[in-house]
Amino acid sequence: SGNSTRSPETNGLSCGYPGENCTATTVQPKRKGHFSRCPKQYKHYCIKGRCRFVVAEQTPSCICDEGYTGARCERVDLFY
C-alpha cells in the first residue's frame, strides 16, 4: 500500500542502532517523537516515496508512494 515502510521496528524485529536496515513491511503508528525529518544527506534515498528518520535507530526509512515497494521504494509493487 502507499503507506508501507521499511522500518527498524516492524513486526517484532529488534534492530540495532544506528544504520540497520530491516526487511519487514508494515504500517507504522505515528507516535510523537518516533520519527523526524530525514537529514539532508538522505534527500535522494527514497526513490518513489518520502523519507523519514527513525529516531530510535538514527537511520532513514521510506514511506512508499502507492504502487511501489522495497527498502528505497525502488520496485513496482506487482500486487498493487
Epitope: 544506528p18 544504520g19 527498502a71 528505497r72
Partner: antibody
C-alpha cells in the same frame, strides 16, 4: 561481539591505486550501513564514504569523489574501498565503521601512506 | 558544506573537574549531532547521538545538549580514563567532524 577488521593498507606512490577491505563479524552485516572514515597522522577525523545495506545508496566526501569507490559483498561480509589517483593528502589511517549517519563500532584501522 | 567548530582546541583539567566542550555548526543541523572520544592509537568511541542521547554502555557522567547550531558535551566529574580527544560530528548534510578537543591532565 561486533568486529571490523581492515586490511590492504601500505605504501603507494602518488597517482597509484590501492584497495582496502573490511571484514565484518558478530552482527548481520547485510542489514547495516557501513562507512569509511580516515585520520591523517596527528590530525582529526574525516568521513570518506558510506554505503547502504543493499549497496544501492552511496555518498562520498568531495575530497575523494571521482577517485574512490566504495562497495560491499554481503555474501562475504566484506566492505571495500578502491582508491585511485592517490595523493599525498590521502595519507591516513583508514577506519571502517558501522553506520551511515553515526558510527557505533569501528575497526582498528589500516595505514595508507602515499609517498614517492 | 557544513563546518563544525569546536572550542577549546585543548584544555587542562583535574580528576573530579566538570568539563564542558562546545561545538558550533556553520548552519542549523537540528539535533543531528554526535560526540566521540578517541584515545591515542585507538579507534574513536561513540558517546552521544542525536545531540543528547547517551550511547549504550557510556557512563552517565557524559551528557550532551543543544540544538540548531550550538551544542555542548559535559563531563560532570572527570575520571582518569576520560583524558582523551573529543570530536563532534554533524550528520544532517554529509557527515563532517569538528577539529577535536584534547583534554589533558593539569
Amino acid at each position: 561481539q561486533v568486529q571490523l577488521l581492515e586490511s590492504g593498507g601500505g605504501l603507494v606512490q602518488p597517482g597509484g591505486s590501492l584497495r582496502l577491505s573490511c571484514a565484518a563479524s558478530g552482527f548481520t552485516f547485510s542489514r547495516y550501513w557501513i562507512s569509511w572514515v580516515r585520520q591523517a597522522p596527528g590530525k582529526g577525523l574525516e568521513w570518506v564514504s558510506y554505503i547502504d545495506s543493499t549497496g544501492t545508496f552511496i555518498n562520498y566526501a568531495d575530497s575523494v569523489k571521482g577517485r574512490f569507490t566504495i562497495s560491499r559483498d554481503n555474501s562475504k561480509n566484506t566492505l571495500y574501498l578502491q582508491m585511485n589517483s592517490l595523493r599525498a593528502e590521502d595519507t591516513a589511517v583508514y577506519y571502517c565503521a558501522r553506520g551511515g549517519s553515526l558510527f557505533d563500532y569501528w575497526g582498528q584501522g589500516t595505514l595508507v601512506t602515499v609517498s614517492s | 558544506d557544513i563546518q563544525m567548530t569546536q572550542s577549546p582546541s585543548s584544555l587542562s583539567a583535574s580528576v573530579g573537574d566538570r568539563v564542558t566542550i562546545t561545538c558550533r555548526a556553520s548552519q542549523g543541523i537540528i539535533s543531528y549531532l554526535g560526540w566521540y572520544q578517541q584515545k591515542p592509537g585507538k579507534a574513536p568511541k561513540l558517546l552521544i547521538y542525536a545531540a543528547s542521547s547517551l550511547q549504550s554502555g557510556v557512563p552517565s557522567r557524559f551528557s550532551g545538549s543543544g540544538s540548531g547550531t550550538d551544542f555542548t558535551l559535559t563531563i560532570s566529574s572527570l575520571q582518569p580514563e576520560d583524558f582523551a580527544t573529543y570530536y563532534c560530528q554533524q550528520y544532517d548534510a554529509l557527515n563532517t567532524f569538528g577539529q577535536g578537543t584534547k583534554v589533558e591532565i593539569k
